[in-house]
């Protein structure tokens, strides 16, 4: 706490300007009017205040706005934002994209801090949902943002926002997250034609079910091996050799290099060796010819 002292004669600040950098902490506290500071917040960033002086300015704003700062002040916090705690930020109501951009700019180049995470949370709550413009902005500053959300949080993302997602934004997403995002992407891109649709949906296919992969195999999509290796194992296993061949097109040759890795390894174990041989890739480990294949999961379901 800064002790309350009277402002010395002639020291009362008529405006926020560079002369204030020569004020001691107690002089700032006594001589700068909090309401003046709030209306001229945009000037603070241009003045080289010390961290200690910024602490005083923050204290003045906290006193003026005990329930949380208004957004007109928040938008111009600049480097003072770095002094805010998540508890401070939880009191804010933030709805403007320009406010969000201004504060993310302050933190640019650093990892997402607890302050930024709280700010984003307040913003999404203020706007009503994680909309396309917000997602555009957040992924520009933090490419891994989408994959930092839980499946529950992702479930509130509207399909229209998926248009803002770039392939690199999904690099660190795990299967549970893609399970949530894939149906949204399918809905978002449903009106596109075959080849355009595949380009857009490709990054999300780690959440695709078997029936959708079967449908894609009928569309000459030529899926690359990198995408195939990210598919859900349970979605790949029921695919026939012919369907995988159609799905991968010329990339089918890449299966040989991946035969010891999931999901290729597990898929090979489910195929008849006769069928695998038709690929001419020398894939081994299929069900030997003459063996009867029992689908035990089907048997259990019937009993």
């Amino acid at each position: 706490e800064v002790e309350k002292t009277a402002c010395p004669s002639g020291k009362k600040a008529p405006e926020i300007d560079e002369s204030l950098i020569f004020y001691k902490k107690w002089e700032l506290e006594a001589c700068v009017d909090a309401a003046l500071l709030a209306t001229q917040m945009d000037r603070v960033n241009a003045i080289p205040f010390t961290y200690e002086q910024l602490d005083v300015l923050k204290h003045k704003l906290d006193e003026l706005y005990p329930q949380g700062y208004p957004e007109s002040v928040i938008q111009h916090l600049g480097y003072l934002f770095l002094k805010m705690s998540p508890e401070d930020i939880r009191k804010w109501n933030v709805t403007s994209l320009e406010t969000l951009k201004a504060l993310l700019e302050v933190n640019k180049g650093h990892e997402m801090s607890p302050q930024v995470a709280t700010l984003i949370d307040r913003f999404v709550k203020g706007r009503g949902q994680l909309d396309k413009d917000t997602l555009d902005t957040l992924t520009a500053f933090y490419p891994g943002y989408l994959c930092s959300l839980s499946p529950e949080e992702l479930s509130s993302v509207p399909p229209s926002s998926i248009w803002a997602v770039r392939p690199q934004d999904l690099d660190t997403c795990d299967p549970r997250q893609l399970d949530v995002l894939y149906p949204k992407a399918r809905l978002a891109f449903q009106n596109m034609n075959g080849s355009e649709y595949f380009v857009k949906i490709q990054s999300f296919l780690g959440g695709a079910p078997t029936e959708d992969l079967k449908a894609l195999s009928q569309q000459n999509v030529s899926m690359d091996l990198a995408t195939f290796m990210k598919l859900r194992t349970d979605a790949v296993l029921p695919l026939t050799v012919a369907e995988v061949q159609k799905l991968l097109g010329p990339h089918v040759e890449g299966l040989k290099a991946e035969e010891r890795h999931r999901p290729v390894r597990d898929w090979i174990l489910r195929q008849r060796q006769d069928d695998l041989d038709t690929l001419g890739l020398g894939l081994q480990g299929g069900i030997p010819n003459g063996y009867l294949v029992l689908d035990l999961s089907m048997q259990e379901a019937l009993s």
Partner: antibody, heavy 119, light 110 residues
Framework: QEQLVESGGGLVQPGASLTLTCTAS????????MCWVRQAPGKGLEGIAC????????TYYASWAKGRFTISKASSTTVTLQMTSLTAADTATYFC????????????WGPGTLVTVSS | DVVMTQTPSPVSAAVGGTVTIKCQAS??????LAWYQQKPGQPPRLLIY???NLESGVPSRFKGSGSGTEFTLTISDLECDDAATYYC????????????FGGGTEVVVR
Amino acid sequence: QEQLVESGGGLVQPGASLTLTCTASGIDFSRYYMCWVRQAPGKGLEGIACIYIGGSGSTYYASWAKGRFTISKASSTTVTLQMTSLTAADTATYFCARGTNLNYIFRLWGPGTLVTVSS
Amino acid sequence: DVVMTQTPSPVSAAVGGTVTIKCQASQSINNGLAWYQQKPGQPPRLLIYSASNLESGVPSRFKGSGSGTEFTLTISDLECDDAATYYCQCIWDGNSYVNAFGGGTEVVVR
């Protein structure tokens, strides 16, 4: 007295280009959204583009307007809207409107300028 | 882009009566909604912002309510001067909201 006035409207041929100007007076122009909104005869309001004056200078466009319309700040008191490849469907009264520093709440509007695209 | 859908149009009521205009957003916008009144040959006039806040100088007969995706403008004690077209608009900034006006509702006062 805060005021916005649009200019540059008139009769143009299909395929032509046109630049509209919004001039502000009595306004602190430093922290506002300035937007263009149009209204075809007997129809509703249709937002075109917005620019954030001060700070980032960000521009935002309606999806239908991207590519053919360009909003820019020409001076401290004027904002322009460049329109290209005009068709009869662009015939409308074009309004400029001032938002706040936070959003598109339009408290101040210009009287509008009529653009007629016809051969 | 967010799509704003207004109903009904036109709506008719007698002087002294009440009219209710509804506006629906295609996605949740919390309280990010404004209402405007427009008369022929004039630019729109702001009535309500942030869903329920009355703009300075606007009579208290105008009342806005709602949140999320469903919003309502109620005009009570209707006067002849209230005959106009009313528009709702999502006020958030960003590309998705530049063209976020409802189609308009004409109010006819008998």
